[in-house]
Amino acid sequence: CKAMHVAQPAVVLASSRGIASFVCEYASPGKATEVRVTVLRQADSQVTEVCAATYMMGNELTFLDDSICTGTSSGNQVNLTIQGLRAMDTGLYICKVELMYPPPYYLGIGNGTQIYVIDPEPCPDSDF
């Protein structure tokens, strides 16, 4: 069992459409063929899973389970996009990376990306 460094940006501002993107980069100590990436949200003391994907190196990153996440992988970088965010989803989003295969298992947890989401102002009603 080994620890692994994971880097992610400290702060990201979601777009007016509720979309936030950030890069999660891990310092892979070995040649992993199977990688699992999980995005967790921490708000107050509650930790919840936002989305997760397991992928084979060199293959497309596929988020299952009706995910609000999409992503692509390139080497030791994972480009993550979270959609459908609202102001209430503002929080710390942690990137967790596990090198599942071959052994040894490695686990890395980023310090988190604070995603700020601002709900767009409704358009004022027109008089004509």
Partner: antibody, heavy 121, light 107 residues
């Protein structure tokens, strides 16, 4: 209140099959990773299978890989364990468990059902 | 697989005693360790996760410590309801293995 109720256990012959169910209530079932853990009579605990929130990811130890299949139906709030090619050493009480994340961002078996006994003989 | 070794396997103690159970991991698991309590005929109950964090509703007489490969569960003052079997389990990678258990009996 979180409630997990297992069913489907019983006596089965070696080589036979059995499907266990776990009915969940008191929480949003589709938001949680779920697992099965077993305990042979008078013995310790052994993790058997894990499934992600939507069922897209499953994991098993070598002892049951290829023989057991974990699945879930989120519309019915129910977890399943299909057990094929059963062996005498699979005799155990099977518990379903809800996994929660702790402050270390790793899952723990936070809530357990009362268990259902599977006897292979 | 990571081997988890608990000691002692059996422990006799009296109400009011302070008891300590040890769990050793076969390799470094950092703080990814949980403790469970199981009473006869009942399901296990989560006591501690992340080596030292008390689960919801668990009395403060229970405490956990350690990291790396050596961990301890301490009950500061045994109560009658604490006589049970205790298991440690690592949650670092897969498979997530349990210790063999420590049966705590009334002396």
């Amino acid at each position: 209140e979180v409630q997990l109720v297992e069913s489907g256990g019983g006596l089965v012959q070696p080589g036979g099959s059995l499907r266990l169910s776990c009915a969940a209530s008191g929480f949003t079932f589709s938001s949680y990773t779920m697992s099965w853990v077993r305990q042979a009579p008078g013995k310790g605990l052994e993790w058997v299978a894990t499934i992600s929130r939507g069922g897209g990811y499953t994991s098993y130890p070598d002892s049951v890989k290829g023989r057991f299949t974990i699945s879930r139906d989120n519309s019915k709030n129910t977890l399943y364990l299909q057990m094929n090619s059963l062996r005498a050493e699979d005799t155990a009480v099977y518990y379903c468990a809800r996994e929660d994340y702790g402050s270390s961002y790793v899952h723990w078996f936070a809530y357990w059902g009362q268990g259902t006994l599977v006897t292979v003989s | 697989d990571i081997q988890m070794t608990q000691s002692p396997s059996f422990l006799s103690a009296s109400v009011g005693d302070r008891v300590t159970i040890t769990c050793r991991a076969g390799e470094n698991i950092y703080s990814y360790l949980a403790w469970y309590q199981q009473k006869p005929g009942k399901a296990p109950k989560l006591l501690i996760y992340n080596a030292r964090t008390l689960a919801e509703g668990v009395p403060s007489r229970f405490s956990g410590s350690g990291s790396g490969t050596e961990f301890t569960l301490t009950i500061s003052s045994l109560q009658p309801e604490d006589f049970a079997t205790y298991y440690c389990q690592h949650h670092y990678g897969s498979p997530r293995t349990f210790g063999g258990g420590t049966k705590l009996e009334i002396k």
